[in-house]
Interface confidence: medium
C-alpha cells in the first residue's frame, strides 16, 4: 500500500527559462492521499524564503498527482529568482527543492526567440 505522506516533487536544481511579458505557470507537483494539504509558494531572498501571499494561485488535479500553480500573468523581469513550495500536513511543514526562473527582458533582446528555441539554446538568454 502506498505511503500517505505528502510529497512535493519539484526537481532538485530545476530551472525554467522564460520571457518577460509572457504568461507562465510554475507548477508544484503535490502527492497526497485523503486530505489536500495547505500549500504555499515563497521566493528565496538570501537564506530566507519570502511567502507570496498576494499572488494568483490555483490547483490542477490529475489522476495520480495534483499541481499547485503559481501564475505569472505576465512574467516581469523581477520575477527572476528561485522559488519553493511548502505544504502544511498534520502539523508538519514539508518544503520542496527550489526551482529557478531565468527571465529574459524582451526589451534587451534584439530578436525574440521562441520558447522552444530558448529551451534548447539557453545561451540566447545572455546575449
Amino acid at each position: 500500500k502506498e505511503s500517505c505522506d505528502v510529497q512535493l516533487y519539484i526537481k532538485r536544481q530545476s530551472e525554467h527559462s522564460i520571457l518577460a511579458g509572457d504568461p507562465f505557470e510554475l507548477e508544484c507537483p503535490v502527492k497526497y492521499c485523503a486530505n489536500r494539504p495547505h500549500v504555499t509558494w515563497c521566493k528565496l531572498n538570501g537564506t530566507t524564503c519570502v511567502k507570496l501571499e498576494d499572488r494568483q494561485t490555483s490547483w490542477k488535479e490529475e489522476k495520480n498527482i495534483s499541481f499547485f500553480i503559481l501564475h505569472f500573468e505576465p512574467v516581469l523581469p523581477n520575477d527572476n529568482g528561485s522559488y519553493r513550495c511548502s505544504a502544511n500536513f498534520q502539523s508538519n511543514l514539508i518544503e520542496s527543492h527550489s526551482t529557478t526562473l531565468y527571465v529574459t527582458d524582451v526589451k534587451s533582446a534584439s530578436e525574440r526567440p521562441s520558447k522552444d528555441e530558448m529551451a534548447s539554446r539557453p545561451w540566447l538568454l545572455y546575449r
Epitope: 502506498e2 505511503s3 505522506d5 510529497q7 512535493l8 516533487y9 526537481k11 532538485r12 536544481q13 530545476s14 530551472e15 525554467h16 527559462s17 522564460i18 507548477e27 507537483p29 502527492k31 495520480n64 498527482i65 499541481f67 514539508i94 527543492h97 520558447k115 522552444d116 530558448m118 529551451a119 534548447s120 539557453p122
Partner: antibody
Amino acid sequence: EVQLQESGPSLVKPSQTLSLTCSVTGDSITSAYWNWIRKFPGNKLEYMGYISYSGSTYFNPSLKSRISITRNTSKNQYYLQLNSVTTEDTATYYCARSHYYGYYFDYWGHGTTLTVSS
Amino acid sequence: DIVLTQSPASLAVSLGQRATISCRASETIDSYGDSLMHWYQQKAGQPPKLLIYRASNLESGIPARFSGSGSRTDFTLTINPVEADDVATYYCQQTDEDPYTFGGGTKLEIK
C-alpha cells in the same frame, strides 16, 4: 494509451552527428518529462537527459559538450542530437516519459539500434 | 553520480521458488522524503518495463509476485514464485539525483 516511437538512422559514420526523433501519442509533451536513454552492447543503461514540460533541459554531464535535446510542441515530438559520434556511441537508443510523481519511466519507446562505423 | 551496485549479476532459480535481487546505492536515496528507487524488467529485444516505483509500489498490470522493499541505501526486488515468463534482465534505477543512474543489471534464468 501513451505511445512513444523513435526514428532515425541505423548507421552513422564516426565524427558525424546523430539525430533521432521521438514521436509521442496519447499525451502532450507539455506535461511531464521526456527522456533519452541508451543501452550499450554490454547491457549497460545510460541516462542521457530530458526536456521538461516547460522546455527546460538537463543533460548528463558525461555528454554535455555533445548533446542537445529540443522539441516541436505542434508535432508532439522531441529530438536528440549527438555530435562527433564515435564507435563508443553504438547502442540502442530509447525515448521514455517520466512522471512528475517520482520521475520513474512509465512509458518507453521500442528503441532504435545505432551502429557507428566507417 | 550515485552508483548503484546490483547483486548477483546472474541468478538461476527453480520454477516456483523465490528470487531476490539486491541494489545498493553509494549515497542515500531520500532527498524528496521518499525513496526514488525503481525496478525494471527487460526481455530480449524489448524496452525496459516498469515493475516497481518508489521502492515498493507495484506498477499497474504487474503481477503481485513482484515486490520491492528497502530504504536509504539498500533495496530489494523479490519475485515469488518465479515463473518461466520471468526470464529477463532486471535493473534498479534511482531518480533522486541528476544524473539518473541504473544498476548493472541482474540476469534471471530458470534452473
